[in-house]
């Protein structure tokens, strides 16, 4: 599931990883657009064990995964992309 989040917490990522994370370990992918005090786009993978990983937006695997998820969401049920802020 892809989610676009707008939060009040400046940048959440300091270090980003390009290491592949298998889909079976992923609960959700958050995309934080530039702005809100953070000058760059951030991609945060929530793993099923509740740990999170900041992923390099340029990593090929995350780009491919997001493209697959976008295509799947546009051709099936309601689009699982949410704009939400955790207060």
């Amino acid at each position: 599931v892809l989610e676009v989040y707008y939060t009040s917490l400046r940048c959440r990522c300091v270090q980003e990883s390009s290491v592949f994370i298998p889909r079976r370990f992923i609960d959700r992918i958050q995309i934080l657009p530039r702005g809100n005090g953070c000058p760059r786009k951030e991609i945060i993978v929530w793993k099923k064990n509740k740990s999170i990983v900041c992923v390099d937006p340029q990593a090929e695997w995350i780009q491919r995964m997001m493209e697959v998820l976008r295509k799947r969401s546009s051709s099936t049920l309601p689009v699982p992309v949410f704009k939400r802020k955790i207060p």
């Epitope: 989610e3 959440r12 270090q15 609960d27 929530w46 509740k50 740990s51 999170i52 955790i86 207060p87």
Partner: antibody, heavy 123, light 111 residues
């Protein structure tokens, strides 16, 4: 506005089960990334994390208390609860419910707290 | 478990003083380039209040005289100019590893 309010008996007998409820407002317990938990503070002492529960019902417990503790939630009532069994005088404390910030999952912090409720264990 | 040791346990200071409280973790609380160390203030009969998160980020609404620094195992909370309302007990907390653990507290008293 985020608010948390603890409720429960102020006095519990030794060997019985302590039951507390926290009623929340200003957020939903089912929102992705949301976690809530319990912390206690014995008289004149420091803070001790007891347990927390995530939006998807995943539960985390302090190993020192795990055998006696159960945390649960009722999303429809905006409530979550703590049960601590086989209590002794050492469980006398102020019990706080709190909301996790919701940014880093298992590496988060307590951003909002209830005002606390005093529980005394005595016969 | 990660043990958190605060020093001093108590401290007497005057309004206007600069005060530093330290917290040492028994192992590193850093991950992803972030220090998962947080500071709370507690006044008598009240719940703790979040002051600083991620070692140095000031919580919204907290006065700028509070600041945090450090990484790895050694952290400090600094109050640049003590105000009357700052006399309280301060706790550090780590969340890098379960179980989340707190320091024993530092009681800041009026000299």
């Amino acid at each position: 506005q985020v608010q948390l309010q603890e409720s429960g008996p102020g006095l519990v007998k030794p060997s019985e089960t302590l039951s507390l409820t926290c009623t929340v407002s200003g957020f939903s317990l089912s929102t992705f990334g949301m976690g809530v938990g319990w912390i206690r503070q014995p008289p004149g002492k420091g803070l001790e994390w007891i347990a927390h529960i995530w939006w998807d019902d995943d539960r985390r417990y302090n190993p020192a208390l795990k055998s006696r503790v159960t945390i649960s939630k009722d999303t429809s009532k905006n409530q979550f609860s703590l049960k601590l069994s086989s209590v002794t005088a050492a469980d006398t404390a102020v019990y706080y419910c709190a909301r996790i910030a919701g940014y880093y999952g298992s590496r988060d912090w307590f951003a909002y707290w209830g005002q606390g409720t005093t529980v005394t264990v005595s016969s | 478990d990660i043990q958190m040791t605060q020093s001093p346990s108590s401290l007497s200071a005057s309004v206007g003083d600069r005060v530093t409280i330290t917290c040492r973790a028994s192992e590193s609380v850093d991950n992803m380039g972030i220090s998962f160390m947080h500071w709370y203030q507690q006044k008598p009969g009240k719940a703790p209040k979040l002051l600083i998160f991620r070692a140095s980020d000031l919580e919204s609404g907290v006065p700028s005289r509070f600041s945090g620094s450090g990484s790895g195992t050694d952290f400090t909370l600094t109050i640049s100019s003590l105000q009357p309302e700052d006399f309280a007990t301060y706790y550090c907390q780590q969340s890098n590893k379960d179980p989340w653990t707190f320091g024993q507290g530092t009681k800041l008293e009026i000299k």
